[in-house]
Amino acid sequence: APISSHCRLDKSNFQQPYITNRTFMLAKEASLADNNTDVRLIGEKLFHGVSMSERCYLMKQVLNFTLEEVLFPQSDRFQPYMQEVVPFLARLSNRLSTCHIEGDDLHIQRNVQKLKDTVKKLGESGEIKAIGELDLLFMSLRNACI
């Protein structure tokens, strides 16, 4: 398996009750606006074929896509949660900026691309869905990166 380096986050990032709660509240608010319950972004298909040691790198890719293509464009919605959660997630992204995989990451990029394609295909409702799954993103980052 490819070797990942610097793919670690301190557990203290995930032990802040206030921002954790705001992240979950944002996900809940967005999920109320999500009518497409048949499609899931963060689930078994995303992790398929990705070893445990590669998952932080995988989630870094998902986090960066979510920030750049979903949260920044939708930043005026779901206030006041959005204005607090986006900087928090951006800090996590920054801390993972040196997280790389040495070797072939094609299988990871393939899984991430499927997630991106799903969001793009669904348009704005795909973006809402991605925000509604921020709790899953948060938990996946925590489990994979600490």
């Epitope: 709660n21 999920s31 109320l32 048949d38 992790f47 070893s51 445990m52 938990m139 996946s140």
Partner: antibody
Framework: EVQLVQSGAEVKKPGASVKVSCQAS????????IHWVRQTPGQGFEWMGW????????RYAQKFQGWVTMTRDMSNTTAYMELPRLRDDDTAVYYC????????????WGQGTLVTVSS | QSVLTQPPSVSVAPGKTATITCGGN??????VHWYQQRPGQAPVLVIY???DRPSGIPERFSGSRSGNTATLTISRVEAGDEADFYC???????????FGGGTKLTVL
């Protein structure tokens, strides 16, 4: 065939400890979390916690925090759950089960280990 | 005490449809999974992510969710379906797995 095989039934006295094992086969052990869940007639199913076989990291339910210990041995693809200071109400069937992310469905379960606590 | 509410028992005639419900607060952004447990055996996953079916599980088993209620539906019920059924979710706020109290399905 993917399977989780648990150790046999145990009878313990109150105050004693028990260590249940769960041997995995048929898949890459390090790629799935191993959870422990117990089932009692009174409480139904109770999720106890998980161990990440890749790192040895653990997460415990609040009720079992500071009490239960979950470990793993990569060399024999086995996870362990140890409960010290057993009480009568710890009599239960203890199951190990695997999941992909730490919060996904339990797609494979062990056969269960009956632990009876009785004086 | 379980935070997920299931009816203790459901009875159905062979060939008919059985419906088992699971209610809970703030279900909206949780994923519901269903397990079948026959007497003396370990649970088996029959539905996950509300409505997905694992390979090997008959198409007669289906799941759905509306608001704060998830539903497991078993069509064309057979005698071999008799078992206890449990719903389960992951509660992110408490970071723990939660199970329903179980429903005993009796095939008349």
């Amino acid at each position: 065939e993917v399977q989780l095989v648990q150790s046999g039934a145990e009878v313990k006295k109150p105050g004693a400890s028990v260590k249940v094992s769960c041997q995995a086969s048929g898949y890459t052990f390090s790629d799935y979390y191993i959870h422990w869940v117990r089932q009692t007639p009174g409480q139904g199913f109770e999720w106890m916690g998980w161990v990440n076989p890749d790192t040895g990291g653990t997460r415990y339910a609040q009720k079992f925090q500071g009490w239960v210990t979950m470990t793993r041995d990569m060399s024999n693809t086995t996870a362990y759950m140890e409960l010290p200071r057993l009480r009568d109400d710890d009599t239960a069937v203890y199951y190990c089960a695997r999941d992909l992310t730490g919060f996904d469905p339990f797609d494979i379960w062990g056969q269960g280990t009956l632990v009876t606590v009785s004086s | 005490q379980s935070v997920l509410t299931q009816p203790p028992s459901v009875s159905v005639a062979p060939g008919k449809t059985a419906t088992i419900t699971c209610g809970g607060n703030n279900f909206r952004n949780k994923r519901v999974h269903w397990y079948q447990q026959r007497p003396g055996q370990a649970p088996v996953l029959v539905i996950y992510y509300d409505s997905d079916r694992p390979s090997g599980i008959p198409e007669r088993f289906s799941g759905s969710r509306s608001g704060n209620t998830a539903t497991l539906t078993i069509s064309r019920v057979e005698a071999g379906d008799e078992a206890d059924f449990y719903c389960q979710v992951w509660d992110f706020l408490t970071d723990s797995g939660s199970f329903g109290g179980g429903t005993k399905l009796t095939v008349l």
